[in-house]
Amino acid sequence: QEEDLPRPSISAEPGTVIPLGSHVTFVCRGPVGVQTFRLERDSRSTYNDTEDVSQASPSESEARFRIDSVREGNAGLYRCIYYKPPKWSEQSDYLELLVKESSGGPDSPDTEPGSSAGPTQRPSDNSHNEHAPASQGLKAEHLY
Protein backbone atom coordinates (compact mmCIF):
# COMPACT_ATOMS: atom_id res chain seq x y z
CA GLN A 1 0.00 0.00 0.00
CA GLU A 2 1.24 3.47 -0.87
CA GLU A 3 2.44 5.47 2.12
CA ASP A 4 0.84 8.78 2.96
CA LEU A 5 2.59 11.79 1.53
CA PRO A 6 5.09 13.36 3.94
CA ARG A 7 4.20 16.77 5.32
CA PRO A 8 6.07 19.63 3.71
CA SER A 9 8.43 21.89 5.63
CA ILE A 10 8.62 25.67 5.49
CA SER A 11 11.46 28.04 6.23
CA ALA A 12 12.25 31.68 5.54
CA GLU A 13 15.44 33.25 4.22
CA PRO A 14 17.20 35.22 5.58
CA GLY A 15 14.93 34.77 8.59
CA THR A 16 11.52 35.28 10.10
CA VAL A 17 12.03 38.82 11.44
CA ILE A 18 12.39 41.11 8.45
CA PRO A 19 12.93 44.88 8.36
CA LEU A 20 10.33 46.91 6.50
CA GLY A 21 11.29 47.17 2.83
CA SER A 22 13.70 44.22 2.89
CA HIS A 23 13.18 40.98 1.00
CA VAL A 24 12.21 37.57 2.30
CA THR A 25 11.96 34.21 0.58
CA PHE A 26 9.76 31.41 1.85
CA VAL A 27 11.14 27.97 1.03
CA CYS A 28 8.73 25.03 0.82
CA ARG A 29 10.19 21.53 0.72
CA GLY A 30 8.62 18.17 -0.07
CA PRO A 31 9.44 14.86 -1.74
CA VAL A 32 10.54 14.50 -5.33
CA GLY A 33 7.77 14.43 -7.90
CA VAL A 34 5.89 17.47 -6.64
CA GLN A 35 3.88 19.18 -9.38
CA THR A 36 2.77 22.28 -7.48
CA PHE A 37 3.76 23.94 -4.22
CA ARG A 38 1.31 26.28 -2.55
CA LEU A 39 2.16 28.93 0.04
CA GLU A 40 -0.88 29.71 2.16
CA ARG A 41 -1.23 32.88 4.18
CA ASP A 42 -3.14 32.89 7.51
CA SER A 43 -6.15 31.10 6.11
CA ARG A 44 -6.56 28.82 3.16
CA SER A 45 -8.38 31.45 1.13
CA THR A 46 -5.18 33.38 0.41
CA TYR A 47 -2.42 31.54 -1.40
CA ASN A 48 0.12 31.50 -4.19
CA ASP A 49 0.89 28.48 -6.33
CA THR A 50 4.05 27.73 -8.23
CA GLU A 51 5.11 24.95 -10.54
CA ASP A 52 8.67 26.25 -10.52
CA VAL A 53 9.87 23.26 -8.53
CA SER A 54 13.55 22.36 -8.24
CA GLN A 55 15.30 19.34 -6.81
CA ALA A 56 16.97 20.24 -3.54
CA SER A 57 18.46 16.78 -2.97
CA PRO A 58 18.02 13.27 -4.37
CA SER A 59 14.98 12.81 -2.13
CA GLU A 60 13.64 16.35 -1.80
CA SER A 61 12.17 19.06 -4.01
CA GLU A 62 11.59 22.69 -3.16
CA ALA A 63 9.94 25.89 -4.30
CA ARG A 64 10.79 29.45 -3.36
CA PHE A 65 8.34 32.30 -2.86
CA ARG A 66 10.01 35.72 -2.73
CA ILE A 67 8.65 39.01 -1.44
CA ASP A 68 10.92 41.73 -2.77
CA SER A 69 9.89 44.53 -0.43
CA VAL A 70 8.23 43.48 2.81
CA ARG A 71 5.35 45.61 4.07
CA GLU A 72 3.61 45.56 7.44
CA GLY A 73 0.72 43.77 5.79
CA ASN A 74 2.99 40.84 4.98
CA ALA A 75 3.35 39.96 8.66
CA GLY A 76 1.45 36.85 9.67
CA LEU A 77 1.33 33.10 9.54
CA TYR A 78 2.43 31.13 6.48
CA ARG A 79 2.41 27.44 5.64
CA CYS A 80 3.04 25.16 2.69
CA ILE A 81 1.13 22.41 0.97
CA TYR A 82 1.94 20.54 -2.23
CA TYR A 83 0.30 18.51 -4.97
CA LYS A 84 2.07 15.32 -5.94
CA PRO A 85 -0.22 13.71 -8.49
CA PRO A 86 -2.75 12.48 -7.83
CA LYS A 87 -2.89 13.72 -4.22
CA TRP A 88 -2.52 16.84 -2.11
CA SER A 89 -0.38 16.66 0.99
CA GLU A 90 -1.16 17.80 4.48
CA GLN A 91 -0.09 21.31 5.38
CA SER A 92 3.20 22.17 7.03
CA ASP A 93 3.41 23.78 10.42
CA TYR A 94 2.85 27.52 10.44
CA LEU A 95 5.78 29.89 10.16
CA GLU A 96 5.24 33.37 11.57
CA LEU A 97 6.73 36.30 9.69
CA LEU A 98 7.41 39.40 11.79
CA VAL A 99 8.01 42.78 10.18
CA LYS A 100 9.95 45.38 12.13
CA GLU A 101 10.77 49.00 11.59
CA SER A 102 14.29 49.26 10.23
CA SER A 103 16.39 50.76 13.03
CA GLY A 104 19.49 51.06 10.92
CA GLY A 105 21.77 50.87 13.95
CA PRO A 106 25.05 48.99 13.39
CA ASP A 107 24.58 46.92 16.53
CA SER A 108 21.09 45.70 15.73
CA PRO A 109 20.96 42.65 13.50
CA ASP A 110 18.65 42.98 10.50
CA THR A 111 17.28 39.48 10.70
CA GLU A 112 17.23 36.32 12.69
CA PRO A 113 18.88 33.31 11.08
CA GLY A 114 16.63 31.45 8.68
CA SER A 115 15.09 28.43 10.33
CA SER A 116 12.25 26.01 9.90
CA ALA A 117 12.00 25.53 13.65
CA GLY A 118 12.17 27.68 16.76
CA PRO A 119 9.75 30.10 18.38
CA THR A 120 8.32 31.42 15.13
CA GLN A 121 7.14 27.98 14.01
CA ARG A 122 3.63 27.09 15.12
CA PRO A 123 1.84 23.79 14.77
CA SER A 124 -0.76 23.71 12.05
CA ASP A 125 -4.34 23.52 13.26
CA ASN A 126 -4.55 20.12 11.51
CA SER A 127 -8.15 20.73 10.60
CA HIS A 128 -7.06 20.29 7.01
CA ASN A 129 -8.41 17.28 5.18
CA GLU A 130 -5.34 15.91 3.47
CA HIS A 131 -7.24 14.67 0.45
CA ALA A 132 -9.60 17.58 -0.14
CA PRO A 133 -8.04 20.84 0.99
CA ALA A 134 -10.54 23.37 2.21
CA SER A 135 -9.27 26.05 -0.14
CA GLN A 136 -11.43 24.36 -2.76
CA GLY A 137 -14.01 26.79 -3.99
CA LEU A 138 -12.26 29.89 -2.66
CA LYS A 139 -10.74 32.56 -4.85
CA ALA A 140 -6.98 32.59 -4.96
CA GLU A 141 -5.82 35.95 -3.69
CA HIS A 142 -2.22 36.88 -4.31
CA LEU A 143 -0.05 37.01 -1.24
CA TYR A 144 2.03 39.85 -2.54
Epitope: P86, A132, P133
Partner: antibody, heavy 121, light 107 residues
Protein backbone atom coordinates in the same frame (compact mmCIF):
# COMPACT_ATOMS: atom_id res chain seq x y z
CA UNK B 1 -17.50 27.52 -20.15
CA UNK B 2 -15.08 24.64 -20.00
CA UNK B 3 -15.07 22.51 -23.14
CA UNK B 4 -12.97 19.62 -24.37
CA UNK B 5 -13.37 19.04 -28.09
CA UNK B 6 -12.05 15.72 -29.33
CA UNK B 7 -11.07 14.76 -32.88
CA UNK B 8 -13.28 12.65 -35.13
CA UNK B 9 -13.63 8.89 -35.43
CA UNK B 10 -10.68 6.88 -36.69
CA UNK B 11 -10.59 3.70 -38.75
CA UNK B 12 -7.13 2.13 -38.71
CA UNK B 13 -5.39 -1.01 -39.89
CA UNK B 14 -3.77 -3.42 -37.43
CA UNK B 15 -0.14 -2.51 -36.74
CA UNK B 16 -0.56 1.16 -37.59
CA UNK B 17 -0.81 4.22 -35.31
CA UNK B 18 -3.39 6.92 -34.66
CA UNK B 19 -3.07 10.28 -32.94
CA UNK B 20 -6.13 11.60 -31.15
CA UNK B 21 -6.52 15.23 -30.12
CA UNK B 22 -8.37 17.02 -27.35
CA UNK B 23 -8.67 20.81 -27.63
CA UNK B 24 -9.37 22.61 -24.37
CA UNK B 25 -11.15 25.94 -23.99
CA UNK B 26 -12.78 27.95 -21.23
CA UNK B 27 -9.97 27.59 -18.71
CA UNK B 28 -6.21 27.99 -18.40
CA UNK B 29 -4.85 24.91 -20.13
CA UNK B 30 -1.66 24.78 -18.05
CA UNK B 31 -3.45 24.95 -14.70
CA UNK B 32 -4.92 21.44 -14.89
CA UNK B 33 -3.96 17.93 -15.87
CA UNK B 34 -5.50 16.06 -18.77
CA UNK B 35 -6.47 12.40 -18.39
CA UNK B 36 -7.30 9.85 -21.08
CA UNK B 37 -9.80 7.06 -20.46
CA UNK B 38 -10.68 4.04 -22.64
CA UNK B 39 -14.11 2.45 -22.92
CA UNK B 40 -14.73 -0.62 -25.03
CA UNK B 41 -18.25 -1.20 -26.28
CA UNK B 42 -20.52 -2.19 -23.40
CA UNK B 43 -17.60 -2.16 -20.95
CA UNK B 44 -16.39 -0.04 -18.10
CA UNK B 45 -13.85 2.80 -17.91
CA UNK B 46 -10.10 2.18 -18.02
CA UNK B 47 -7.62 4.92 -17.16
CA UNK B 48 -4.78 5.21 -19.66
CA UNK B 49 -2.72 8.10 -18.39
CA UNK B 50 -2.52 11.74 -17.48
CA UNK B 51 -0.39 14.67 -18.62
CA UNK B 52 0.33 18.02 -16.99
CA UNK B 53 0.70 20.52 -19.83
CA UNK B 54 2.53 23.08 -17.69
CA UNK B 55 5.69 20.96 -17.59
CA UNK B 56 4.89 17.91 -19.70
CA UNK B 57 4.99 15.48 -16.78
CA UNK B 58 2.98 12.39 -17.60
CA UNK B 59 1.81 9.28 -15.80
CA UNK B 60 0.71 6.02 -17.41
CA UNK B 61 -1.03 2.82 -16.53
CA UNK B 62 1.47 -0.03 -16.72
CA UNK B 63 -0.84 -1.75 -19.21
CA UNK B 64 -0.38 0.95 -21.84
CA UNK B 65 3.17 2.17 -21.32
CA UNK B 66 4.24 0.68 -24.64
CA UNK B 67 0.96 1.52 -26.34
CA UNK B 68 0.19 5.18 -25.64
CA UNK B 69 2.16 8.42 -25.65
CA UNK B 70 0.67 11.61 -24.24
CA UNK B 71 1.77 15.05 -25.34
CA UNK B 72 0.43 18.58 -25.03
CA UNK B 73 0.82 21.75 -27.07
CA UNK B 74 0.48 24.79 -24.84
CA UNK B 75 0.25 27.22 -27.75
CA UNK B 76 -2.94 25.61 -29.06
CA UNK B 77 -4.28 24.30 -25.72
CA UNK B 78 -4.45 20.85 -27.23
CA UNK B 79 -3.55 17.48 -25.77
CA UNK B 80 -2.71 14.47 -27.87
CA UNK B 81 -2.64 10.72 -27.40
CA UNK B 82 -0.82 8.53 -29.89
CA UNK B 83 -1.72 4.85 -29.93
CA UNK B 84 0.71 2.58 -31.78
CA UNK B 85 0.91 -1.03 -32.91
CA UNK B 86 -2.86 -1.14 -33.04
CA UNK B 87 -4.77 -4.37 -32.56
CA UNK B 88 -8.46 -5.18 -32.33
CA UNK B 89 -8.14 -4.80 -28.53
CA UNK B 90 -7.58 -1.09 -29.08
CA UNK B 91 -10.99 -0.66 -30.73
CA UNK B 92 -12.82 1.55 -28.23
CA UNK B 93 -14.06 5.03 -27.46
CA UNK B 94 -11.36 7.22 -25.93
CA UNK B 95 -12.29 10.12 -23.67
CA UNK B 96 -10.15 13.00 -22.53
CA UNK B 97 -11.03 14.53 -19.18
CA UNK B 98 -9.77 17.57 -17.32
CA UNK B 99 -7.94 16.60 -14.13
CA UNK B 100 -8.74 19.60 -11.97
CA UNK B 101 -6.55 20.07 -8.94
CA UNK B 102 -5.98 23.81 -8.81
CA UNK B 103 -8.29 24.54 -5.89
CA UNK B 104 -6.95 21.81 -3.70
CA UNK B 105 -8.80 18.72 -4.78
CA UNK B 106 -8.50 16.24 -7.61
CA UNK B 107 -11.24 15.01 -9.90
CA UNK B 108 -12.02 14.54 -13.58
CA UNK B 109 -14.62 17.25 -13.70
CA UNK B 110 -15.11 17.86 -17.44
CA UNK B 111 -15.03 15.26 -20.21
CA UNK B 112 -14.71 15.38 -23.96
CA UNK B 113 -17.34 13.79 -26.18
CA UNK B 114 -15.11 10.81 -26.96
CA UNK B 115 -13.34 9.58 -30.08
CA UNK B 116 -14.21 6.20 -31.56
CA UNK B 117 -11.26 4.16 -32.80
CA UNK B 118 -11.95 1.07 -34.89
CA UNK B 119 -9.09 -1.25 -35.77
CA UNK B 120 -9.92 -3.51 -38.68
CA UNK B 121 -8.20 -5.05 -41.65
CA UNK C 1 -3.20 -1.68 -8.28
CA UNK C 2 -6.22 -0.75 -6.21
CA UNK C 3 -9.27 -2.77 -7.22
CA UNK C 4 -12.72 -1.22 -6.82
CA UNK C 5 -15.64 -3.65 -6.59
CA UNK C 6 -19.10 -2.24 -7.23
CA UNK C 7 -22.34 -3.90 -6.22
CA UNK C 8 -24.87 -4.72 -7.29
CA UNK C 9 -23.99 -5.04 -10.97
CA UNK C 10 -27.57 -4.12 -11.87
CA UNK C 11 -30.22 -2.36 -9.84
CA UNK C 12 -33.82 -2.36 -11.09
CA UNK C 13 -35.89 0.41 -9.55
CA UNK C 14 -39.07 2.40 -9.98
CA UNK C 15 -39.02 6.21 -10.12
CA UNK C 16 -39.48 7.53 -6.61
CA UNK C 17 -37.49 4.71 -5.01
CA UNK C 18 -34.42 5.55 -2.95
CA UNK C 19 -31.35 3.45 -3.67
CA UNK C 20 -27.80 2.85 -2.46
CA UNK C 21 -24.88 1.79 -4.66
CA UNK C 22 -21.79 0.25 -3.10
CA UNK C 23 -18.11 0.57 -3.97
CA UNK C 24 -15.46 -1.39 -2.04
CA UNK C 25 -11.71 -0.77 -2.38
CA UNK C 26 -9.11 -3.53 -2.09
CA UNK C 27 -7.13 -1.36 0.34
CA UNK C 28 -7.72 1.79 2.30
CA UNK C 29 -7.98 4.89 0.12
CA UNK C 30 -9.08 7.37 2.81
CA UNK C 31 -11.71 9.52 1.08
CA UNK C 32 -10.04 9.59 -2.34
CA UNK C 33 -13.11 8.19 -4.07
CA UNK C 34 -15.26 9.86 -6.72
CA UNK C 35 -18.55 8.91 -8.36
CA UNK C 36 -19.51 9.36 -12.03
CA UNK C 37 -22.75 8.89 -13.94
CA UNK C 38 -22.76 7.81 -17.58
CA UNK C 39 -25.87 7.65 -19.69
CA UNK C 40 -25.99 5.64 -22.88
CA UNK C 41 -23.84 7.13 -25.66
CA UNK C 42 -22.74 10.03 -23.45
CA UNK C 43 -19.59 11.02 -21.63
CA UNK C 44 -19.24 10.37 -17.89
CA UNK C 45 -20.28 13.16 -15.53
CA UNK C 46 -18.78 13.84 -12.10
CA UNK C 47 -21.42 13.44 -9.37
CA UNK C 48 -19.55 13.33 -6.06
CA UNK C 49 -15.92 14.03 -5.20
CA UNK C 50 -13.94 12.85 -2.19
CA UNK C 51 -16.59 10.34 -1.12
CA UNK C 52 -19.13 12.90 0.07
CA UNK C 53 -18.50 16.34 -1.41
CA UNK C 54 -21.23 17.66 -3.67
CA UNK C 55 -20.62 19.06 -7.13
CA UNK C 56 -22.13 22.30 -8.40
CA UNK C 57 -25.04 21.62 -10.75
CA UNK C 58 -25.66 18.06 -9.51
CA UNK C 59 -29.12 17.54 -7.99
CA UNK C 60 -29.17 17.32 -4.20
CA UNK C 61 -30.79 13.88 -4.32
CA UNK C 62 -27.31 12.49 -4.99
CA UNK C 63 -25.14 12.03 -1.92
CA UNK C 64 -22.10 10.01 -0.98
CA UNK C 65 -20.63 8.57 2.18
CA UNK C 66 -17.85 6.31 3.38
CA UNK C 67 -14.13 6.30 4.03
CA UNK C 68 -11.31 3.79 3.99
CA UNK C 69 -12.55 0.85 1.96
CA UNK C 70 -16.36 1.08 1.92
CA UNK C 71 -18.27 3.75 0.05
CA UNK C 72 -21.90 4.37 -0.84
CA UNK C 73 -23.65 6.53 -3.41
CA UNK C 74 -27.25 7.25 -2.43
CA UNK C 75 -30.00 8.54 -4.68
CA UNK C 76 -32.96 9.88 -2.77
CA UNK C 77 -36.10 9.39 -4.86
CA UNK C 78 -34.84 8.26 -8.25
CA UNK C 79 -36.00 10.19 -11.30
CA UNK C 80 -36.24 8.82 -14.84
CA UNK C 81 -33.24 10.88 -15.92
CA UNK C 82 -31.08 9.00 -13.39
CA UNK C 83 -31.10 5.70 -15.24
CA UNK C 84 -27.72 4.71 -16.61
CA UNK C 85 -24.32 3.51 -15.40
CA UNK C 86 -22.58 4.62 -12.22
CA UNK C 87 -18.83 4.27 -11.75
CA UNK C 88 -16.62 4.86 -8.74
CA UNK C 89 -13.00 5.91 -9.20
CA UNK C 90 -10.06 6.22 -6.82
CA UNK C 91 -7.39 8.91 -6.86
CA UNK C 92 -5.37 7.63 -3.93
CA UNK C 93 -2.49 6.36 -6.06
CA UNK C 94 -1.40 5.60 -9.60
CA UNK C 95 -2.75 3.96 -11.59
CA UNK C 96 -6.14 5.56 -11.24
CA UNK C 97 -8.77 2.84 -11.32
CA UNK C 98 -12.51 2.61 -11.84
CA UNK C 99 -15.06 0.15 -10.60
CA UNK C 100 -16.82 -2.04 -13.17
CA UNK C 101 -19.99 -0.03 -12.69
CA UNK C 102 -23.55 -0.44 -11.48
CA UNK C 103 -26.36 -0.25 -14.01
CA UNK C 104 -29.43 1.54 -12.72
CA UNK C 105 -32.39 0.44 -14.82
CA UNK C 106 -36.16 0.78 -14.87
CA UNK C 107 -38.01 -2.07 -13.17
Amino acid sequence: QVQLQQSGAELARPGTSVKLSCKASGYTFTSCGLSWVKQRTGQGLEWIGEIYPSNGNSYYSDKVKDKATLTADKSSSTAYMELRSLTSEDSAVYFCARAYYTNGYYAMDYWGQGTSVTVSS
Amino acid sequence: DIVLTQSPATLSVTPGDSVSLSCRASQSISNNLHWYQQKSHESPRLLIKYASQSISGIPSRFSGSGSGTDFTLSINSVETEDFGMYFCQQSNSWPLTFGAGTKLELK
